[in-house]
């Protein structure tokens, strides 16, 4: 038999953040290797990660072709050292993944505060727009490009001297908030897709950034502007 000592994969799990999408499974192979196939509900199967001893397969390139489609993957188990034989008609053991719809299910990555700028009693806080691997006309799209107004950001801000938090929301990447003159504030943002009703509707909070911390440094994510 061509599938002697091979066992079907199990615990097939999608891990996806900002559309970077990896299928994981068990077990680590002993006498076998794996090949993954992926398709949409109406499409043909496409093979990826041929005869791999890994227990993961990056399927980003396939799912970004249409992030609103629903995908199904399956993992085939072949004997280790397998060379595809032309005469074998026996189907190797395989296991199906759960269905996966990237637009609805990809996790939102941790956002980053790009800059904040104070003018008088107003502070403009800008959230960095994350790039994804989704393309349109050979151009990579940002998270905002993909989700549009489905994506909002929540800003949490508080005086450095107290713990009482206030919140603001925006469906752009910028906030303009009122602050007390002479007070330093701290900020953290969270990405949210309000239309989702599942655990993945919110990202983790961004790192906290505070006014009055004169780092004087330029970061990859942009400059902090402190105008006092």
């Amino acid at each position: 038999s061509g599938t002697t000592n091979t066992v079907a994969a199990y615990n097939l799990t999608w891990k996806s953040t900002n559309f970077k999408t990896i299928l994981e499974w068990e077990p680590k192979p002993i006498n076998q290797v794996y090949t993954v196939q992926i398709s949409t509900k109406s499409g043909d199967w496409k093979s990826k990660c041929f005869y791999t001893a890994d227990t993961e397969c990056d399927l980003t390139d396939e799912i970004v072709k249409d992030v609103k489609q629903t995908y199904l993957a399956r993992v085939f188990s072949y004997p280790a050292g397998h060379v595809e034989s032309t005469g074998s008609t026996e189907e190797p053991p395989y296991e199906n993944s759960p269905e996966f719809t990237p637009y609805l299910e990809t996790n939102l990555g941790q956002p980053t505060i790009q800059s904040f700028e104070q003018v008088g009693t107003k502070v403009n806080v800008t959230v960095q727009d994350e790039w994804t691997l989704v393309r349109r006309n050979d151009t990579f799209l940002s998270l905002r490009d993909v989700f549009g107004k489905d994506l909002i950001y929540t800003l949490y801000y508080w005086k450095s001297s107290s713990s009482g938090k206030k919140t603001a929301k925006t469906n752009t990447n910028e906030f303009l908030i009122d602050v007390d003159k002479g007070e330093n504030y701290c900020f953290s943002v969270q990405a949210v897709i309000p239309s989702r009703r599942t655990a993945n509707r919110k990202s983790t909070d961004s790192p906290v950034e505070c006014m009055g911390h004169e780092k004087g440094e330029s970061r990859e994510t942009g400059h902090h502007h402190h105008h006092h």
Epitope: K15, I22, E26, P27, I30, N31, A53, E56, G81
Partner: antibody
Framework: QVQLQQWGAGLLKPSETLSLTCAVY????????WSWIRQPPGKGLEWIGE???????RYNPSLKSRVTISVDTSKNQFSLKLSSVTAADTAVYYC??????????????????WGKGTTVTVSS | EIVLTQSPGTLSLSPGERATLSCRAS???????LAWYQQKPGQAPRLLIY???SRATGIPDRFSGSGSGTDFTLTISRLEPEDFAVYYC?????????FGGGTKVEIK
Amino acid sequence: QVQLQQWGAGLLKPSETLSLTCAVYGGSLSGYYWSWIRQPPGKGLEWIGEIGASGSTRYNPSLKSRVTISVDTSKNQFSLKLSSVTAADTAVYYCARDTPYYYEGGYYYYMDVWGKGTTVTVSS
Amino acid sequence: EIVLTQSPGTLSLSPGERATLSCRASQSVSSSYLAWYQQKPGQAPRLLIYGASSRATGIPDRFSGSGSGTDFTLTISRLEPEDFAVYYCQQVGVVPYTFGGGTKVEIK
């Protein structure tokens, strides 16, 4: 010869987040799994979790809600974060390479390269 | 979770004697996933045996491993002074990966 060099804060207060990093010298992250293991004082070894070069993770269910293991292939290093620590998290923390070895039609797995260990103490 | 039970907890022997360490699994473990490690005070564990019976690079041939299924054994044919240490078995097949509680081989 592959070597693992690890570092991170050694003294934490309860509720803080433990953060350790392990750098891989003399070899690649690719093709291996990278584990964190800990050993409380005078006790045995406990596996925390592992990560593949592309970022796939496996965690010990007893710690899963508090653990994040990440990888930075550009720096050839991987990291451990353990949130909301208590005195029970006091231990020596080791990073290790989990090697899949192919021989005569099958794979074998073992941890063949270890860091020297970082002592982490949680105390108020 | 696969529980690995090592026995005895402590083995008191003299240099030159034979040491037999046992590792029993709560459910069957493929030998491909079973390894043995040696640990000395203040040091990281060191791989001795993988695949239940294959010696790691640089390990002297006085160390040997055997067994399958749920019962595995590490044997040190003639104890050298540097062999007095704690020995752990480990399985890396089923999450969570687990270690045995260890056997301490001490000088009698």
